[in-house]
């Protein structure tokens, strides 16, 4: 569906221009579509006199005024003028309402059925107004920020909201900061987290006409300083025909900056390790986390002399941690066999 | 109490360097993140970047990008600000602000908010 | 980057009037964004986040309301303390970005 075509879909009430003046009283978190003249001509849009962008929560588009939910703040007076002149087609005040009712929910929404000029709606059970965004269940957020939740719905009458946690009222009576609910938002906040506030918290949406609700699931993440954490089994054992490129990949985790070394093993004199007990090395490769692709070690065109042991060093302020990893270089005449190489070595 | 003070301000030639530091005490260092946000004499505020002290990540305003760089150093609860091959139109009082995240679950995204500020210092850049 | 336009850009008020600036955004931030104050010669101060909820702290004088595009700062009876320049930031996209900001300044 094109755009146009999708907004034809919903439900728009059309003032009649016999009545320009017009008053129409809207219930918190209603969508609103009202039309002004037809759709490749309608007219512009204005609120306050200021005109309406095509985009946005408030929208004049395509001679429609258009409000995906009804807030306080969106109360006042709209006029529409014909495109190319100032010519008032609508001319409409629209005000705060609590809660719509309507003695026949059959009606058609385009007819006008009340004679004081005020718009109602017919009775509708909750529904999300967004709801390919609750989707995601479950949320992990660091320790000491702030989590808000939100269930934006709409319904008529307007339906009111109320929060669970791990299915009791939640009311952040017994929690360190308490929390704060903004109910034209549909919104709950918590304000530095701690791993008490993990647990399930359940959005009770509800009007005399039904109910509706959604769980979020919340994981409150401790952070203590640590040396890099690296993903195990990596770097892999690796095994290569010679003049092929090879990758080898090391991720790193780390609360503290990290700096990343790659290290190949070499031999001196017959030996691998220095009378210091250490193992000799060549750096191939260093940087820290934020350089481009510095967990990738990339080996080109690769020769037998390239064969052997490889390490991912990583260190922060806390400390070091490496793994290594083996790389076996076929000649290219034989590529099906295979040698055994040891186990890749992990030490935190 | 949280409070941040900056150091490292001065006067530097243009195409010079200089690496500003925001001592940070009274919170969990690593729960957070650091901005760092300019302000050239008269004018208004300009966000520079950001780091988060969990992951390391950081982001920054395309203005300084490839010039500047944010760390920090968890073991000193110290943030730094490394700026090369300057401008005059760095000239600014640079501060830093401790900066924690509203995790809005709706929509999956998170706010920034700078509670708390340092005093700011100066960068002068002239010849 | 999302520009962010405060009005008026300064204004003259008495201590006890109520004072109401406005900031718009070039693109929706829905409810992303926050206000600080900051007096001369010193760091600006967290007021409001979300666009409505009062930072710890802050004398409930100060209420912030909108969503999208409009938003707006108000202050109910303004105080001595209450003269200084204030800002509207959106952390939605990225860059973070400011309005230029609003002076309130003794009538």
């Known amino acids: 569906l094109e755009a146009s075509e999708e907004v034809e879909l919903e439900p728009c009430l059309a003032p009649s221009l016999e009545q320009q003046e017009q008053e129409l009283t809207v219930a918190l978190g209603q969508p609103v579509r009202l039309c002004c003249g037809r759709a490749e001509r309608g007219g512009h849009w204005y609120k306050e006199g200021s005109r309406l962008a095509p985009a946005g929560r408030v929208r004049g588009w395509r001679g429609r005024l258009e409000i995906a939910s009804f807030l306080p703040e969106d109360a006042g007076r709209y006029l529409c003028l014909a495109r190319g002149s100032m010519i008032v087609l609508q001319n409409l005040t629209l005000i705060t309402g609590d809660s719509l009712t309507s003695s026949n929910d059959d009606e058609d929404p385009k007819s006008h059925r009340d004679p004081s000029n005020r718009h109602s709606y017919p009775q509708q059970a909750p529904y999300w107004t967004h709801p390919q965004r609750m989707e995601k269940k479950l949320h992990a957020v660091p320790a000491g920020n702030t989590v808000k939740f939100r269930c934006p719905a709409a319904g008529n009458p307007t339906p009111t909201i109320r929060w669970l946690k791990d299915g009791q009222a939640f009311h952040g009576e017994n929690r360190i900061g308490g929390i704060r609910l903004r109910h034209q938002h549909w919104s709950l906040v918590m304000e530095s987290v701690v791993p008490s506030d993990r647990g399930t918290y359940t959005c009770l949406v509800e009007n005399a006409v039904g109910s509706i609700r959604y769980n979020y699931l919340l994981d409150v993440l401790e952070r203590s300083p640590h040396r890099p954490i690296l993903q195990a089994g990596l770097p892999a054992n690796t095994t290569a025909v010679v003049g092929s490129d090879v990758e080898l990949l090391c991720k790193v985790y780390s609360d503290a900056q990290p700096h990343i070394q790659w290290l190949k093993h070499i031999v001196i004199n017959g030996s691998s390790f220095g009378a210091d007990g250490f193992p000799y090395v060549q750096v191939l490769k260093t940087a820290d986390i934020n350089s481009s692709e510095v967990e990738v070690l990339y080996l080109r065109n690769v020769s037998a002399e390239d064969a052997g042991e490889y390490t991912c060093l990583a260190g922060n302020s806390i400390g070091l941690s490496y793994q290594s990893a083996w790389l076996t270089v076929l000649p290219e005449e034989d590529p099906t066999w295979t040698a055994a190489a040891p186990e890749a070595r992990y030490t935190d | 109490e949280v409070q941040l003070v900056e150091s490292g301000g001065g006067l530097v030639q243009p195409g010079g360097s200089l690496r500003l530091s925001c001592a940070a005490s009274g919170f969990t260092f690593t729960s957070t993140g650091i901005s760092w946000v300019r302000q050239a004499p008269g004018k208004g505020l300009e966000w520079v970047g950001r780091?988060?002290?969990?992951?390391?990540?950081?982001n920054y305003a395309d203005s300084v990008k490839g010039r500047f760089t944010i760390s920090a150093d968890t073991s000193k609860n110290t943030a730094y600000l490394q700026m090369n091959s300057l401008r005059a139109e760095d000239t600014a009082v640079y501060y830093c602000?401790?900066?924690?995240?509203?995790?809005?679950?709706?929509?999956?995204?998170?706010?920034?908010?700078?509670?708390?500020w340092g005093q700011g210092t100066l960068v002068t850049v002239s010849s | 980057d999302i520009q962010m336009t405060q009005s008026p850009s300064s204004l003259s008020a008495s201590v006890g009037d109520r004072v109401t600036i406005t900031c718009r955004a070039s693109?929706?931030?829905?409810?992303?964004l926050a206000w600080y104050k900051q007096k001369p010669g010193k760091a600006p101060k967290l007021l409001i986040y979300s666009a409505s909820f009062l930072y710890s702290g802050v004398p409930s004088r100060f209420s912030g309301s909108g969503s999208g595009t409009d938003f707006t700062l108000t202050i109910s009876s303004l105080q001595p303390e209450d003269f200084a320049t204030y800002y509207c930031q959106q952390s939605t996209g990225h860059p973070q970005t400011f309005g230029q900001g609003t002076k309130v300044e003794i009538k």
């Open positions: 780091t988060h002290l969990g992951d390391g990540s950081t």
């Open positions: 693109q929706d931030v829905d409810t992303s």
């Open positions: 602000a401790r900066t924690y995240g509203i995790y809005d679950l709706y929509v999956d995204y998170t706010e920034y908010v700078m509670d708390y």
